[in-house]
């Protein structure tokens, strides 16, 4: 159910492309293709190529992305394209000018002097943005989201985008300065991961991050469980970055117990994050237990 044919507008296409990219990434990282048959990988890659090609139709002259060519470009959508394409670079041929042009646009057009990334044209499909939806800590959450995307594109775009390291530092400064005032577990988790990637989740910030976990195993706010899965996935990635292998097992157990296999309405971010986090766990954790995750690989009929 994770391998789907991407289609529709610039937002729907990314909704459709997400599960296929993350499923292939997960199975690559955990070396599990034998279970499904290697020939299925090729079919999945064709779908990713299709999604990539279709997405280029929604690329604007500024290198940013929107649901439609004539619609104002979205900060969040452009950052998400950067994030997905950065992961897909190892799977299909992606034009670095497409990726790094989007990075440059985010930095030059959407980052304020204090490091914050602003959104002037929110996506139509609000269900695709996960825990950022109706988030009253929007500056922190969106800045963390964009910063994570920039860091994932760093190796690819550093040479083409001179302002990238400075932009990352500035966004990190903003997150660090405001982190201790956060109230939502979701924002603590996503900003925590952004800071951990920079080696800046330390001291009081680390204490805030660790003590925000409920029962030492999940980052949870009242409301949608999908957002808690997404938040806890960000937190797991942060813990892995910190090499805090004492804290990791109960978090992995909790994620596993949710029996969340992705797919369904509003699942874009939870799907992407849970598989990214669990793939990273199986790669990084010294003696990880095998995770029996149900990744179904039925290719869509042509």
């Amino acid at each position: 159910h994770l391998i789907v044919t991407p289609s529709g507008c610039g937002e729907q296409n990314m909704i459709g492309m997400t599960p296929t990219v993350i499923a292939v990434h997960y199975l690559d990282e955990t070396e599990q293709w034998e279970k499904f048959g290697l020939e299925k990988r090729q079919g999945a890659l064709e779908l990713i190529k299709k999604g990539y090609t279709q997405q280029l139709a929604f690329r604007q002259p500024s290198s940013a992305f929107a649901a439609f060519v004539k619609r104002a470009p979205s900060t969040w959508l452009t950052a998400y394209v950067v994030k997905v394409f950065s992961l897909a670079v190892n799977l299909i041929a992606i034009d670095s000018q497409v990726l790094c042009g989007a990075v440059k646009w985010l930095i030059l057009e959407k980052q304020k002097p204090d490091g914050v990334f602003q959104e002037d044209a929110p996506v139509i499909h609000q269900e695709m943005i996960g825990g950022l939806r109706n988030n009253n800590e929007k500056d922190m959450a969106l800045t963390a989201f964009v910063l994570i995307s920039l860091q994932e594109a760093k190796d690819i775009c550093e040479e083409q985008v001179n302002s990238l390291p400075g932009s990352i530092t500035k966004a990190g400064d903003f997150l660090e300065a405001n982190y201790m005032n956060l109230q939502r577990s979701y924002t603590v988790a996503i900003a925590g991961y952004a800071l951990a990637q920079m080696g800046r989740l330390k001291g009081p910030l680390l204490n805030k991050f660790l003590t925000t976990a409920k029962d030492k195993n999940r980052w949870e706010d009242p409301g949608k469980q999908l957002y808690n899965v997404e938040a806890t996935s960000y937190a797991l990635l942060a813990l892995l970055q910190l090499k805090d292998f004492d804290f990791v097992p109960p978090v992995v157990r909790w994620l596993n117990e949710q029996r969340y296999y992705g797919g369904g309405y509003g699942s874009t971010q939870a799907t992407f994050m849970v598989f990214q986090a669990l793939a990273q766990y199986q790669k990084d954790a010294p003696d990880h237990q095998e995770l029996n995750l149900d990744v179904s690989l039925q290719l869509p009929s042509r």
Epitope: N181, Q183, K202, G203, P204, N207, L210, T211, T212
Partner: antibody
Framework: QVQLQQSGAELVRPGTSVKVSCKAS????????IEWVKQRPGQGLEWIGV????????NYNEKFKGKATLTADKSSSTAYMHLSSLTSEDSAVYFC?????????WGQGTLVTVSA | DIQMTQSTSSLSASLGDRVTISCRAS??????LNWYQQRPDGTVKLLIY???RLHSGVPSRFSGSGSGTDYSLTISNLEQEDIATYFC?????????FGGGTTLEIR
């Protein structure tokens, strides 16, 4: 204004336990971490651990695991530190402090004396 | 654990003097250094966080500097109310650790 009011001095027997309280006022209690610090007579300061009153999440200095237990009661805006199996080494002044980027506001300290 | 060393345990100075108190970490603490003042009555106050940022209400005669492993607190114009013990604390790596303190006395 922000205030942390700690409970009064305690004289306790070795082997027993004690609970020190720290009542917060002047701010939203659930929104800030509360840290605990130990100061032995004429000595420096030692970090014991931290509690997040919003989630009851804790993090301890390894040295104080099993010795100190941190709790918080949101309804009364009070943080507590329970110290068990007391020995003369536990005789000290114990401080609570509100964490920001640094221990921004401190209680006045609670002297715990362990003596037979 | 990171060791914090304040090599001078006590310091004599006159009112109006410029006083510098130093603190050394056993490893790089990337600027996560705070300074506290403990008055003779036991009350503790945060003076400076992140090397040089003044906590609210702290007089501007206090300043902090340093990098890597070496840091210092300077009081530019010593006043009677500054007579206290000063502690440095690293906020870089858990567990937090403090220096042994430097006590200021009036000469």
């Amino acid at each position: 204004q922000v205030q942390l009011q700690q409970s009064g001095a305690e004289l306790v027997r070795p082997g027993t336990s004690v609970k020190v309280s720290c009542k917060a006022s002047g701010y939203a209690f659930a929104h800030y971490l509360i840290e605990w610090v130990k100061q032995r007579p004429g000595q420096g300061l030692e970090w014991i651990g931290v509690i997040n009153p919003g989630t009851d999440g804790t993090n301890y200095n390894e040295k104080f695991k099993g010795k100190a237990t941190l709790t918080a009661d949101k309804s009364s805006s009070t943080a507590y530190m329970h110290l068990s199996s007391l020995t003369s080494e536990d005789s000290a002044v114990y401080f609570c402090a509100r964490e920001e980027l640094g221990f921004a506001y401190w209680g006045q300290g609670t002297l715990v004396t362990v003596s037979a | 654990d990171i060791q914090m060393t304040q090599s001078t345990s006590s310091l004599s100075a006159s009112l109006g003097d410029r006083v510098t108190i130093s603190c050394r970490a056993s490893q790089d603490i990337s600027n996560h250094l705070n300074w506290y003042q403990q008055r003779p009555d036991g009350t503790v106050k945060l003076l400076i966080y992140y090397i040089s940022r003044l906590h609210s209400g702290v007089p501007s005669r206090f300043s902090g500097s340093g990098s890597g492993t070496d840091y210092s607190l300077t009081i530019s114009n010593l006043e009677q109310e500054d007579i206290a013990t000063y502690f440095c604390q690293q906020g870089d790596t858990l567990p937090y650790t403090f220096g042994g303190g430097t006590t200021l006395e009036i000469r």
